[in-house]
Interface confidence: low
């Protein structure tokens, strides 16, 4: 009997989406590219549950991890990579005293139990997100999981 795999191999399923936690490090812009290369997006957070899930993954692995959020377009105006604004209620997820823009810190990362702004040119881990496969019998998702890793050697 064929099994349904809503996410590619080494990706994690959560509430209808698939997430890839990288094992290598890139700067913020290259992290965006790495996600695009596998048909995904540097993670855009849309719910409190999703935030809690991702923060837990990041803190458990004790890694500083890029998310798809920056104020590169306009200092102090935080925007997700899909163009949506950072809603005011998201403010509670910044670590105390953040974002502080010390030394042109324009990109957001998971850091400890909250968010931090850091320099976009620093190499960090990253998280990609894409919609999970529907697994209807008409589609080709009834396959053995094939490795799909957005982890080419660092550029």
């Amino acid at each position: 009997e064929r099994l349904c795999h809503p996410c590619p191999w080494e990706w994690t399923f959560f509430q209808g989406n698939c997430y890839f936690m990288s094992n290598s490090q890139r700067n913020w812009h290259d992290s965006i590219t790495a996600c695009k290369e596998v048909g995904a997006q540097l993670v855009v957070i849309k719910s409190a549950e999703e935030q809690n899930f991702l923060q837990l993954q990041s803190s458990r692995s004790n890694r500083f991890t890029w998310m798809g959020l920056s104020d590169l377009n306009q200092e102090g105006t935080w925007q997700w990579v899909d163009g949506s604004p950072l809603l005011p209620s998201f403010k509670q997820y910044w670590n105390r005293g953040e974002p502080n823009n010390v030394g042109e810190e324009d990109c957001a990362e998971f850091s400890g139990n909250g968010w931090n702004d850091d320099k976009c040119n620093l190499a960090k881990f990253w998280i990609c997100k894409k919609s999970a496969a529907s697994c209807s019998r008409d589609e080709e998702q009834f396959l053995s999981p094939a490795p799909a890793t957005p982890n080419p050697p660092p550029a």
Epitope: K46, Q51, G83, S84, P85, L87, S89, K91
Partner: antibody, heavy 122, light 106 residues
Framework: QVTLRESGPALVKPTQTLTLTCTFS??????????VTWIRQPPGKALEWLAL???????YYSTSLKTRLAISKDTSKNQVVLTMTNMDPVDTATYYC??????????????WGRGTLVTVSS | DIQMTQSPSTLSASVGDRVTITCRAS??????LAWYQQKPGKAPKLLIY???SLESGVPSRFSGSGSGTEFTLTISSLQPDDFATYYC????????FGQGTKVEIK
């Protein structure tokens, strides 16, 4: 039990300043993520958002009315006050206060007061 | 500012009917959309948030769908208590309401 109650004058004269108070219970405006907002509804017409204040005192105003509005909070009294200057008969409406829930990413309004009708007439 | 347009403005229906109300945003709002029900002389009541999440205590006959610029509120089987005015509201960028849809008895 969470409740919100609006209070203020039922009648104001044109050019006067309206001051409305929202008194709430069952939640605290010092809780991270909580906001209180003001919305109005002219008789027989649609809802119009006016202003919102966050737990950390950030304030947001309607683009078309921001020069006339001011919102403030008194956390110890569990109150939010809205002032609206230079009142005009077209400002006749039921004024509601509402809250956004803690821990929600979206800023929707989950609980509302009953509203208070304000008539602007000389 | 983001504009919200609801259709129809008025909808005549009977008890048991399946009712659908549409809300369109002037630009993409992702899924940052809420639906409210309002009865005469009463405050609005939250039904749906984040386009499709049902508020606690709201009957399951209410459902929401959509993303981007087009959204729908569906009442699967209209009940006597459902005759009211329904408003959509975006909260992607500040806050804007639609002009309302009145559901009346046919």
């Amino acid at each position: 039990q969470v409740t919100l109650r609006e209070s203020g004058p039922a009648l104001v004269k044109p050019t006067q300043t309206l001051t409305l108070t929202c008194t709430f219970s069952g939640f605290s405006l010092s809780t991270s993520g909580v906001s209180v907002t003001w919305i109005r509804q002219p008789p027989g017409k649609a809802l119009e958002w006016l202003a919102l204040i966050d737990w950390d005192d950030d304030k947001y105003y309607s683009t078309s009315l921001k020069t006339r509005l001011a919102i403030s909070k008194d956390t110890s009294k569990n109150q939010v006050v809205l002032t609206m200057t230079n009142m005009d008969p077209v400002d006749t409406a039921t004024y509601y206060c509402a809250r956004t829930p803690s821990g929600s990413y979206g800023r929707y309004f989950d609980l509302w007061g009953r509203g208070t009708l304000v008539t602007v007439s000389s | 500012d983001i504009q919200m347009t609801q259709s129809p403005s008025t909808l005549s229906a009977s008890v048991g009917d399946r009712v659908t109300i549409t809300c369109r945003a002037s630009q993409s709002i992702s899924t940052w959309l809420a639906w409210y029900q309002q009865k005469p002389g009463k405050a609005p009541k939250l039904l749906i948030y984040e386009a499709s999440s049902l508020e606690s205590g709201v009957p399951s006959r209410f459902s929401g769908s959509g993303s981007g610029t087009e959204f729908t509120l569906t009442i699967s089987s209209l009940q006597p208590d459902d005759f009211a005015t329904y408003y959509c509201q975006q909260y992607n960028s500040y806050w804007t309401f639609g002009q309302g849809t009145k559901v009346e008895i046919k």
